[in-house]
Interface confidence: low
């Protein structure tokens, strides 16, 4: 009762239901590529103010499989992860222990998702589970946004990924994983 294995023109092998395709090999060793250099901190001295053009809100492309419990998408989706520093930022020394701890002062600008796109994915499930389709909300672009105290903090929660969520007023999907779990998977996978 599984999906039939097939081969298309791109010589992609889709396995029988219950087996999962491995992540594409080029994604295995791109950890450094997908991270802000130097742990995201610019290599400069405290008290130095850099021009805003030297900081950018970067859009890093990640490819991942969407999961819903034991089910996994037939094909991976590509989405953006917002990364980088939004300037200008004045870096101040940390008073505690007089260590050099950098933090931005002034208005709080964050590199956060700006636009989202919906994409349909088909999920293949092992063990006789019926295949499923889901709409997932993926980050389409990033933007430096000035945060106010009224700013919805939930916007900051899921920098990396927007997991498929139940519609408003709907029961939680029995096997839907939390955004946090998907985020953890994303971070661990790459």
């Amino acid at each position: 009762q599984g999906w039939q294995a097939f081969k298309n023109d791109a010589t992609e092998i889709i396995p029988e239901l219950g087996e999962y395709p491995e992540p594409p090999p080029e994604l295995e060793n791109n950890k450094t590529m997908n991270r802000a250099e130097n742990g995201g901190r610019p290599p400069h001295h405290p008290f130095e103010t850099k021009d805003v053009s030297e900081y950018s809100c970067r859009e890093l492309h990640f490819t991942r499989y969407v999961t819903d419990g034991p089910c996994r998408s037939a094909k991976p989706v590509t989405e953006l992860v917002c990364s980088g520093q939004c300037g200008p930022a004045r870096l101040l020394p940390n008073a505690i222990g007089r260590g050099k701890w950098w933090r931005p002062s002034g208005p709080d600008f964050r590199c956060i998702p700006d636009r989202y796109r919906a994409q349909r994915v088909q999920l293949l499930c092992p063990g006789g589970e019926a295949p499923r389709a889901r709409k997932v909300r993926l980050v389409a672009s990033c933007k430096c946004k000035r945060l106010t105290r009224f700013h919805n903090q939930s916007e900051l929660k899921d920098f990396g990924t927007e997991a498929a969520r139940p519609q408003k007023g709907r029961k939680p999907r029995p096997r839907a994983r939390s955004a946090k779990a998907n985020q953890a998977e994303l971070e661990n996978a790459y």
Epitope: F6, K75, Q122, E129, A130, P131, R132, A133
Partner: antibody
Amino acid sequence: QVQLVQSGAEVKKPGSSVKVSCKASGYTFTDYFLNWVRQAPGQGLEWMGTIYPYHDGTTYSQKFKGRVTITADKSTSTAYMELSSLRSEDTAVYYCAREEEDGQFDYWGQGTTVTVSS
Amino acid sequence: DIQMTQSPSSLSASVGDRVTITCSASQGIQWYLNWYQQKPGKAPKLLIYYTSSLHSGVPSRFSGSGSGTDFTLTISSLQPEDFATYYCQQHSKLPRTFGGGTKVEIK
């Protein structure tokens, strides 16, 4: 708007095969599962199998496995259901139905009557 | 296979009546249950999906509830166009299976 248009009625001899088509329009054909369901006269609905046209993945009801083949032609947005080794109890109306994301069949073809008679 | 049992198999009711149809699954299907309406000579029409979500264009007099193994379709005030056969369908496990149907007739 979404439409599923099926081929016309068929009369077949026992032991032969029938191939029913279902032409989809009004949506992206490769984005949705396309199911086949049949209904014998005066009986209930019986699921036969499904295809996901994006990669031609199929899954069938065990009852029909080996006798049913579901295919899809992406270039014409048409799905096909072929049933072989026909017997009189295969006389039924055969429906194609698009499947939405919670497993619901939200759009159905008008049905194709297949009569198996010697 | 998961067996879906509908009851009653038929019922007679009058316009304005409140009608309840039940559907029982032979094993737990969480909320993966849909309801369809079918009129003679026509294809089924989706009414309710995922146990309780109303399909677009379906009147609000239709509602669904339940979880696990027991589910209910309720028509709060039966209208002339509601006389038809109703089917439940599970989408938890393969193969997808339908209930035997409940025919709602005019009293």
